[in-house]
Interface confidence: low
Amino acid sequence: KKVVLGKKGDTVELTCTASQKKSIQFHWKNSNQIKILGNQGSFLTKGPSKLNDRADSRRSLWDQGNFPLIIKNLKIEDSDTYICEVEDQKEEVQLLVFGLTANSDTHLLQGQSLTLTLESPPGSSPSVQCRSPRGKNIQGGKTLSVSQLELQDSGTWTCTVLQNQKKVEFKIDIVVLAFQKASSIVYKKEGEQVEFSFPLAFTVEKLTGSGELWWQAERASSSKSWITFDLKNKEVSVKRVTQDPKLQMGKKLPLHLTLPQALPQYAGSGNLTLALEAKTGKLHQEVNLVVMRATQLQKNLTCEVWGPTSPKLMLSLKLENKEAKVSKREKAVWVLNPEAGMWQCLLSDSGQVLLESNIKVLPTWSTPVQP
């Protein structure tokens, strides 16, 4: 008996071939011997089966001795043995219809779980293997779960259902709702304007929700809410903002915040959360601000950084075009009695300069000038 696998909602074509290459009488019946369709001369006739309005054939093939049964908009319950009667012989075809659905919304937040459920006809014992967009293979039976979805899981999931050594492939588009970056770090000199950007890793027609930026300054004992905002159809409106610092927010996506100036008291870490309408859970992005200050007080030239720096970062003070006078894995370095000239304070990681501040040291009778 020939086995054909079909997909719920799809169209399937069951073949039936006669030895004579001409139009002769044929009938398609189900396992209960109820006629589905057949022919009378060159006309298609239909029987009283449940498939009535969804069953068809291709008259253009009859003259070649081919009498297919076409079933449209397949349902799981269409799974059955179909019998083609032609030339005093019977051809049996077993049709098994499967459906695969995401049992939740296909737009899921990062970190949430995806469950794929296989609908299958009674008596079948299929196996399912799904491949995520990043190529991970997941195997299962009637249900298949993936916990802790990541950004790379966005895209088309390809699932193969295997039954009787035949296979049918399903494609399910999954959108993982997340920020493009889980974390970012901004390095600024004291007094510079700071731009924070929070691009989303997905696009949807309408985006509505609300968000908040909580900030934990390095110098502060507790975190505080710097700004709250609403998002309606991709338009941003500020609800509440602190007086110090007075943040400004862009009115359109991507979410964009401006801090008028970087000051040591603002250095620290922030967590932007975004709650989307009709979604449980929130999107998160961490943002870090590192601030540098170079000062000269009497005979002491000092360079300091505030904020979440990694222990491997190097802070150096050097006279322009000369070797570093001092270089330490510390958050403050200084030089006593610095020579006159343009001094550079550098924050670097494995030789790559992340932040630089210049200060001009004048002869001892003058006062310092900050460029």
Partner: antibody, heavy 118, light 108 residues
Framework: EVQLVESGGGLVQPGGSLRLSCAVS????????MHWVRQATGKGLEWVST???????YYPGSVKGRFTISRENAKKFLYLQMNSLRAGDTAVYYC????????????WGQGTTVTVSS | EIVLTQSPGTLSLSPGERATLSCRAS???????LAWYQQKPGQAPRLLIY???SRATGIPDRFSGSGSGTDFTLTISRLEPEDFAVYYC?????????FGPGTKVDIK
């Protein structure tokens, strides 16, 4: 420095059990797929098991039902529980890290020897 | 199960020569899922190539990978003394994630 250090190998009788451990350092363990691969003396490499970041596990038919891979993200440990051991399981067992952006085992431990003999 | 066949079993060459190693899969796999490793006696394997043609970190550019479908190739353009070793291909296309039997490159 990224490091994988296996332990727990030894001599065990057929039908016995062993638990291999792999201590991880130098990277965010929870973000990576992890693998066990074995190699019998003078033979090629044989994939033994994989555990994904979501805890999804994979085994070849030769060990399915006998071996169990698990991970303890907080402690940065990968384990391989081996039951109903057979002489054919005698090998050096390596733990390896799966690539983050690609498929390939990019960091390997030095291996631990398992001998199944009466 | 996808079976990987490597040929030749042994390749005897001199330093400076070009080495061409073949890996054939019993069914078509996406190049994303093919990797090559090098193993020297008493050492753990080392990843050379992932995605059939991308060099892993720190791998010299004399190593290159190519191929698609069922036929993949590892080429060492000019053999250095340290390149004499056993080379394995591996597929991640579907579980079980099989290795090839290996090709030994030894000094002529």
């Amino acid at each position: 420095e990224v490091q994988l250090v296996e332990s727990g190998g030894g001599l065990v009788q057929p039908g016995g059990s062993l638990r291999l451990s792999c201590a991880v350092s130098g990277f965010t363990f929870s973000s990576y797929d992890m693998h066990w691969v074995r190699q019998a003396t003078g033979k090629g490499l044989e994939w033994v098991s994989t555990i994904g970041t979501a805890g999804d596990t994979y085994y070849p038919g030769s060990v399915k039902g006998r071996f169990t891979i698990s991970r303890e993200n907080a402690k940065k440990f990968l384990y391989l529980q081996m039951n109903s051991l057979r002489a054919g399981d005698t090998a050096v067992y390596y733990c390896a890290r799966g690539g983050y952006y690609y498929y390939g085992m990019d960091v390997w431990g030095q291996g631990t020897t398992v001998t199944v003999s009466s | 199960e996808i079976v990987l066949t490597q040929s030749p079993g042994t390749l005897s060459l001199s330093p400076g020569e070009r080495a061409t190693l073949s890996c054939r899969a019993s069914q078509s796999i996406s190049s994303t899922y093919l990797a090559w490793y090098q193993q020297k006696p008493g050492q753990a394997p080392r990843l050379l190539i992932y995605g059939a043609s991308s060099r892993a970190t720190g791998i010299p550019d004399r190593f290159s990978g190519s191929g698609s479908g069922t036929d993949f190739t590892l080429t060492i353009s000019r053999l250095e003394p340290e390149d004499f070793a056993v080379y394995y291909c591996q597929q991640y296309g579907s579980s079980p994630f099989t290795f090839g039997p290996g090709t030994k490159v030894d000094i002529k």
